[in-house]
Interface confidence: low
């Protein structure tokens, strides 16, 4: 699945011929249970994000909203396949759903991975433009640019994930009782180049889907943090409070992304390096055994974003509250305004910010107040 990782069976490395591999110790119901939990939370949470973004009026949407919506769509399209993967895992890796669903659901995993990462990179760059270069790059951040960038990222994600659609298949590789959903390079690779394809696709996937975007994100947040720190040095006590909160959000965004995806990419890379570096058998076996859990952690990322919004963004909480109690008369009047406020919390367009000198919660702000301080910087 990941899958690979998701990748085909590998026979080549000499070091592996000496390793005593045991039959896969199934995680039992743990991974399937997590998948189902991610499915439930992910569909609800990402559905809620889409609902709050799209129910706000067009004028109130900003350039960042399109990335947030895309992120939710990417996560949502992926999490709906999780019941299939939960079943596959629970059945001890026996795929009963046919070849097309194997191809499609595997494809969606990687489309989600690329689209999510690109959305986060887009949001990070959008934040960078908004905070570090708010005036010079105002034109770059128009809604049209956001739409074009989103279209590009989706096309890119769809193309980069295409090898999975091409090579994934179902087959009974070793016995007659279980059908696996796996990568089959035999149509393009000889025996000797099988591993080269696996390594090539694996390394390029990690580079394009993690290393490069993560480097861009870190660079963006480095300059953002630098700018915020510079501005806040000029602020008084209220500014110090905001500095702590804004910087903590930035740290949480980067750390959450890294925590969820780093184990997957790290273990995958180490496993592939094994053919060159000849890891000790115990370490090689450890990598193989830990990989499903790394995959599981990376999938959890698809349901975390809404919780991060809810935890760090009071306006998103308001929007959720307004939806939850919109049927009650006492909330009915606040429903629309709350979602409008929420829209602003995701926004990044300072060309049409709220009323003069009004910050979060309607606080009066200092004359010297930086233009982005009315916004929450939650981007993941």
């Amino acid at each position: 699945m990941e899958e690979g990782g998701d990748f085909d069976n590998y026979y080549g490395a000499d070091n592996q011929s000496e390793c005593e591999y045991t039959d896969w110790k199934s995680s039992g119901a743990l991974i399937p249970a997590i998948y189902m939990l991610v499915f439930l939370l992910g569909t609800t949470g990402n559905g809620l994000v889409l609902w709050t973004v799209f129910r706000s009026s067009r004028e109130k949407r900003r350039s960042a909203d399109i990335f947030i919506a895309s992120l939710a769509v990417a996560d949502l399209t992926f999490v709906v396949t999780l019941p299939l993967w939960a079943t596959y895992t629970y059945r001890d890796y026996d795929w009963p759903f046919g070849t097309f669903s194997c191809k499609l659901s595997s494809y969606l995993i990687f489309v989600n991975m690329y689209a999510s990462v690109f959305c986060l990179t887009g949001l990070s760059f959008d934040r960078y433009l908004a905070i570090v270069r708010p005036v010079a790059n105002a034109r770059l951040r128009l809604r049209v640019s956001g739409a074009v960038a989103t279209a590009v990222l989706w096309v890119l994600a769809a193309l980069l994930a295409m090898p999975v659609m091409v090579f994934r298949t179902t087959g009974d590789l070793e016995n007659t009782t279980k059908v696996q959903c796996y990568m089959d390079y035999s149509m393009v690779a000889t025996v000797s180049s099988d591993w080269a394809w696996e390594v090539g696709l694996g390394v390029s996937s990690t580079t394009v889907g993690f290393v490069v975007p993560f480097t861009i994100m870190l660079t963006c947040y480095f300059f953002i943090a630098q700018t915020i720190a510079g501005h806040f040095r000029k602020e008084r006590i209220e500014g110090l409070r905001k500095r702590r909160r804004l910087l903590s959000i930035i740290v949480v965004l980067v750390v959450t992304f890294a925590l969820c995806w780093m184990p997957y990419h790290l273990v995958k890379t180490l496993y592939m390096l094994g053919s060159l570096l000849h890891w000790p058998c115990d370490f090689d076996l450890f990598l193989m055994n830990v990989f499903p859990y790394c995959t599981c952690i990376s999938y959890v990322n698809s349901c975390l974003n809404p919780f991060l919004y809810a935890f760090f963004d009071p306006r998103f909480r308001q929007a959720c509250t307004s939806m939850l109690c919109c049927g009650q008369s006492r909330c009915a009047g606040t429903s629309h305004s709350s979602s409008g406020e929420k829209s602003a919390s995701y926004s990044s367009g300072h060309s049409q910010g709220p009323g003069p000198n009004m910050g979060k919660g309607g606080e009066q702000m200092h004359e010297k107040s930086i233009p982005y301080s009315q916004e929450t910087l939650v981007v993941d």
Epitope: M1, F7, N9, Y11, W24, E174, V267, Y271, M288
Partner: antibody, heavy 129, light 107 residues
């Protein structure tokens, strides 16, 4: 030292039964699939049967299905082949062999197969009246 | 069942010769094939697994190649201890099947 030692062979009449044993040492027996392979006089090697670690999967060549049963006793590090309704064509040297399997981490479940890497010296079964 | 056809069934060669044995599967078996060496009265010994991967401890003069239906075992320079019978084994599907064997004799 990794070692497999077969026993239980002998002379048996057609229609009779025999139970072959294979004692394993030098490796974690419960971690491996195990196989039986035979070599009939003047013929080539023939794979007979194999069994998964926990006994949940067993496979047989068509000519022995319903007559032979492969089993294992992990506590005794032993592999067994119960042979019933023996025929003259079952006459052969029977080898037990260790099967090497692993998993591709990235497909989590796709088994790759190394083949039979450790063999015993064999035990002779003669079916004759 | 997948039939494995080995050729030649026997061959005579001298020490230092390059020897090639082929194995043909009745249907595609990817690279799910191994090569085994057996000497009279001895247990078989695995030389190659997965069509081309050399078993640890086996001299590098042995090599395997092929994928799909055509496979080859090559001994680059025949040594006295290499005179034996060689078998290919497919493990792509059950029942596993061996080739009929190739006996390599001294010329």
């Amino acid at each position: 030292e990794v070692q497999l030692v077969e026993s239980g062979g002998g002379l048996v009449q057609p229609g009779g039964s025999l139970r072959l044993s294979c004692a394993a040492s030098g490796f974690t027996f419960s971690n491996y699939w195990m196989s039986w392979v035979r070599l009939a006089p003047g013929k080539g090697l023939e794979w007979v049967a194999n069994i998964k670690q926990d006994g949940s999967e067993r496979y047989y060549v068509g000519s022995v299905k319903g007559r032979f049963t492969i089993s294992r006793g992990d506590a005794k590090n032993s592999l067994y082949l119960q042979m019933n309704s023996l025929r003259a064509e079952d006459t052969a040297v029977y080898y037990c062999a260790r099967d090497r399997f692993g998993y591709s981490a990235f497909d989590k479940g796709v088994r790759y197969y190394y083949g039979m890497d450790v063999w015993g010296q064999g035990t002779t079964v003669t079916v004759s009246s | 069942d997948i039939q494995m056809t080995q050729s030649p069934s026997s061959l005579s060669a001298s020490v230092g010769d390059r020897v090639t044995i082929t194995c043909r599967a009745s249907q595609g078996i990817r690279n799910d094939l191994g090569w085994y060496q057996q000497k009279p009265g001895k247990a078989p010994k695995r030389l190659i697994y997965a069509a081309s991967s050399l078993q640890s401890g086996v001299p590098s003069r042995f090599s395997g190649s092929g994928s799909g239906t055509e496979f080859t075992l090559t001994i680059s320079s025949l040594q006295p201890e290499d005179f034996a019978t060689y078998y290919c084994l497919q493990h792509n599907s059950y029942p596993r099947t061996f080739g009929q064997g190739t006996k390599v004799e001294i010329k």
